[in-house]
């Protein structure tokens, strides 16, 4: 037995025929000693008398609300939950499982940027005496702080037959860094309790996997003359992070006819315009990513050929201003070829996402992440990689993109993907480490040696365990050259001489 | 002892208005959500919806919304069922029934004796 | 909204039998299931909630048991006060939904 909260208890109960329950002593919140009587919310009948009462809890009926009286005057409650557990499994009877994007997920998180802010959502179809609490935090063994708000009804729909409804809530880490590469996953834990049944359920993640940003703003056409195409233009989403010249969008531009059986005509672009075909009757629609690390696209927003005009895609609110303004050179050093380590690490992102595309589908956490990886070198929020540090002295963070460069280059040229299960003919893995080696040369200045990480020693026994490391490197290998691009992106525009 | 006492019964025409009232006593009329349950003749039960009696708020089945009306009068202990432009498809017995719990709402525990309204053609 | 089929719609039985009703649900509905006794001219009584447990003064010939969509509720003997109505009632998801109903017969 646990307390949840002030006067509630969990009792945790293994549900089999005939189990024989939790003994539980309950006791009156009452300096009084004598004349104290029991009864229990749900029976009408005295169940007991003295300062404590010994119950057997088994099921449902042994659950609920005790209270302690005296002389017909309330002393105290004591509220009594039950948790099941069958099999050894918690139960999930409270939530629906939304099975995106995998069986079991009662949870869905999404952020619009990076500012540690993020909102969750579940779906029930239970609409009495219902509640939720949420608590959530980076890491769990040694927790930072993450504020949730209280979860609200967001939406009710009819499916079929049945009523669903949707609850959300917002949090907001409360030490964000979002130009860091996150180590450490966000936790949320939500307590729901219907009538007498307790269930928790929780979930996992890095915010860059949860990044959906709102779709772009301002999207207009301009007819071009003596051409049947337009120019078409948009925005970056007023809710999406700033500078935009450190976090960049891409953006994939489509036409579409009027019926859906029409062929989609697609244009993959960075920047916030591009030149289409539009004919009559179609809609041009734009949607956007990270330019850098494969997580969600926004929805669409859209705007009919016919005529030009605005879009009917969402714009949020909150956030300012686009790229900075250019910058001095960096001092106590040479500056770097910000252009050509850009270019190299924008396609290092590429490299990296076609040697794992599937990753963001797979929770690897949940293979006993911690020993296997906690050795690769992370961009930390001291590091100097945000905007500001690459302005003040951009060397702090060059040196440990470096490092890590150096890393990766050596656990990819390393047993761990030489060994077997051979890599494909055609595999990327090997372009990957060839660039990595590359930026890293790049990035190195003549006779200048940083110093770099001792590479662990990760010698896996067995191919599945080879696998799954690849899977892991690649994984955080994914977040760390994010990072870098965005610092060389950012560089090219602000800091080249 | 706990006791729900409905109103006697009732004989209506066509597009009239019936309110039934449910005195509870016994326990805190405010501690318990008060549900109404119709049964028309020789028919099943069909929950109609309830009124939680802390806050005054009601919750209606779809087959409930628009005609019908839960109130309170809670100094009286008293919950009301209000049928406005009353039908021959309303002709049934009505019951009030309390929830079992402060935790299990539409779980009925106790009832009305029932009220039995007719239409008169 | 959750249809809760009761079976048999009819008993006919002898004082001392045991009696078996079923009601299965068009969905599940967990354990939130009560079952109700209704005597001729009488307003309905609670016997089992949670599904298997016996309201404060039913007397314990009368059980119940299930989970998800299959519940089931026994009388081991049946005496000849049992004459009635029974009801099932799930009370997971609105609108909370009753069975249709076994009319209990005493031979």
């Known amino acids: 037995i646990w307390e949840l909260k002030k006067d509630v208890y969990v009792v945790e109960l293994d549900w089999y025929p005939d189990a024989p329950g939790e003994m539980v002593v309950l006791t009156c919140d009452t300096p009084e000693e004598d004349g104290i009587t029991w009864t229990l919310d749900q029976s009408s009948e005295v169940l007991g008398s003295g300062k404590t009462l010994t119950i057997q809890v088994k099921e449902f009926g042994d659950a609920g609300q005790y209270t302690c009286h005296k002389g017909g005057e309330v002393l105290s409650h004591s509220l009594l939950l039950l948790h099941k557990k069958e099999d050894g499994i918690w139960s999930t009877d409270i939530l629906k499982d939304q099975k995106e994007p995998k069986n079991k997920t009662f949870l869905r998180c999404e952020a619009k940027n990076y500012s540690g802010r993020f909102t969750c959502w579940w779906l029930t179809t239970i609409s009495t005496d219902l509640t939720f609490s949420v608590k959530s935090s980076r890491g769990s063994s040694d927790p930072q702080g993450v504020t949730c708000g209280a979860a609200t009804l967001s939406a009710e729909r009819v499916r079929g037959d049945n009523k669903e409804y949707e609850y959300s809530v917002e949090c907001q880490e409360d030490s964000a860094c979002p130009a860091a590469e996150e180590s450490l996953p966000i936790e949320v834990m939500v307590d729901a309790v219907h009538k007498l049944k307790y269930e928790n359920y929780t979930s996992s993640f890095f915010i860059r996997d949860i990044i959906k940003p709102d779709p772009p703003k301002n999207l207009q056409l301009k007819p071009l003359k003596n051409s049947r195409q337009v120019e078409v233009s948009w925005e970056y989403p007023d809710t999406w992070s700033t500078p935009h010249s450190y976090f960049s969008l891409t953006f994939c531009v489509q036409v579409q006819g009027k019926s859906k059986r029409e062929k989609k005509a697609r244009v993959f672009t960075d920047k916030t315009s591009a030149t289409v075909i539009c004919r009559k009757n179609a809609s041009i629609s734009v949607r956007a990513q990270d330019r850098y690390y494969s997580s969600s696209w926004s929805e669409w927003a859209s705007v009919p050929c016919s005529g030009s005009g605005s879009s009917r895609g969402g714009s949020g609110s909150g956030g300012s201003g686009g790229g900075g303004s250019k910058l001095r050179a960096v001092p106590g050093g040479s500056s770097p070829a910000w252009t050509q380590c850009q270019q190299l690490s924008q396609k290092l992102c590429t490299l990296a996402w076609s040697a794992h595309p599937l990753v963001g589908h797979m929770d690897l956490r949940e293979e006993g992440d911690e020993e296997t990886t906690n050795d690769v070198p992370h961009i930390q929020c001291g590091d100097g990689c945000d905007p500001q540090g690459l302005r003040d002295n951009s060397q702090f963070c060059l040196q440990r993109i470096h490092q890590g460069l150096i890393f990766y280059e050596k656990l990819l040229g390393s047993d761990i993907f030489t060994g077997e299960p051979s890599l494909l003919p055609d595999s990327p893995v090997g372009q990957l480490h060839a660039s990595l080696l590359g930026l890293s040369q790049l990035l190195q200045p003549e006779g200048h040696h940083w110093e770099t990480q001792q590479i662990p020693s990760l010698s896996p026994s067995q191919p599945w365990q080879r696998l799954l490391l690849r899977f892991k490197i690649l994984r955080s290998l994914q977040a760390f050259v994010a990072v870098a691009a965005r610092v060389f992106a950012h560089g090219a525009a602000t800091l080249s001489p | 002892q706990i006791q729900l006492v409905q109103s006697g019964p009732e004989l209506k025409k066509p597009g009239e208005t019936v309110k039934i009232s449910c005195k509870a006593s016994?326990?805190?009329?405010?501690?318990?959500?008060m549900n109404w349950v119709k049964q028309a003749p020789g028919k099943g039960l069909k929950w109609m919806g309830w009124i939680n009696t802390y806050t005054g708020e009601p919750t209606y089945a779809d087959d409930f919304k628009g005609r019908f009306a839960f109130s309170l009068e809670t100094s009286a202990s008293t919950a009301y069922l209000q049928i406005n432009n009353f039908k021959n498809e309303d002709t049934a017995t009505y019951f009030c029934?309390?929830?079992?719990?402060?935790?299990?709402?539409?779980?009925?525990?106790?009832w009305g004796q029932g009220t039995l309204v007719t239409v008169s053609s | 909204s959750i249809v809760m089929t009761q079976t048999p719609k009819f008993l006919l039985v002898s004082a001392g039998d045991r009696v078996t009703i079923t009601c299965k649900a068009s969905q599940s509905v967990s354990n939130d299931v009560a079952w109700y006794q209704q005597k001729p001219g009488q307003s309905p009584k609670l016997l089992i909630y949670?599904?298997?447990n016996r309201y404060t003064g039913v007397p314990d010939r009368f059980t119940g048991s299930g989970y998800g969509t299959d519940f089931t509720f026994t009388i081991s003997t049946v005496q000849a006060e049992d004459l009635a109505v029974y009801f099932c009632q799930q009370d997971y998801s609105s609108p909370y939904t009753f069975g249709g109903g076994t009319k209990l017969e005493i031979k």
């Open positions: 016994g326990y805190t009329f405010t501690n318990y959500g």
């Open positions: 949670y599904a298997s």
């Open positions: 029934a309390r929830s079992l719990s402060t935790m299990i709402t539409t779980t009925f525990a106790y």
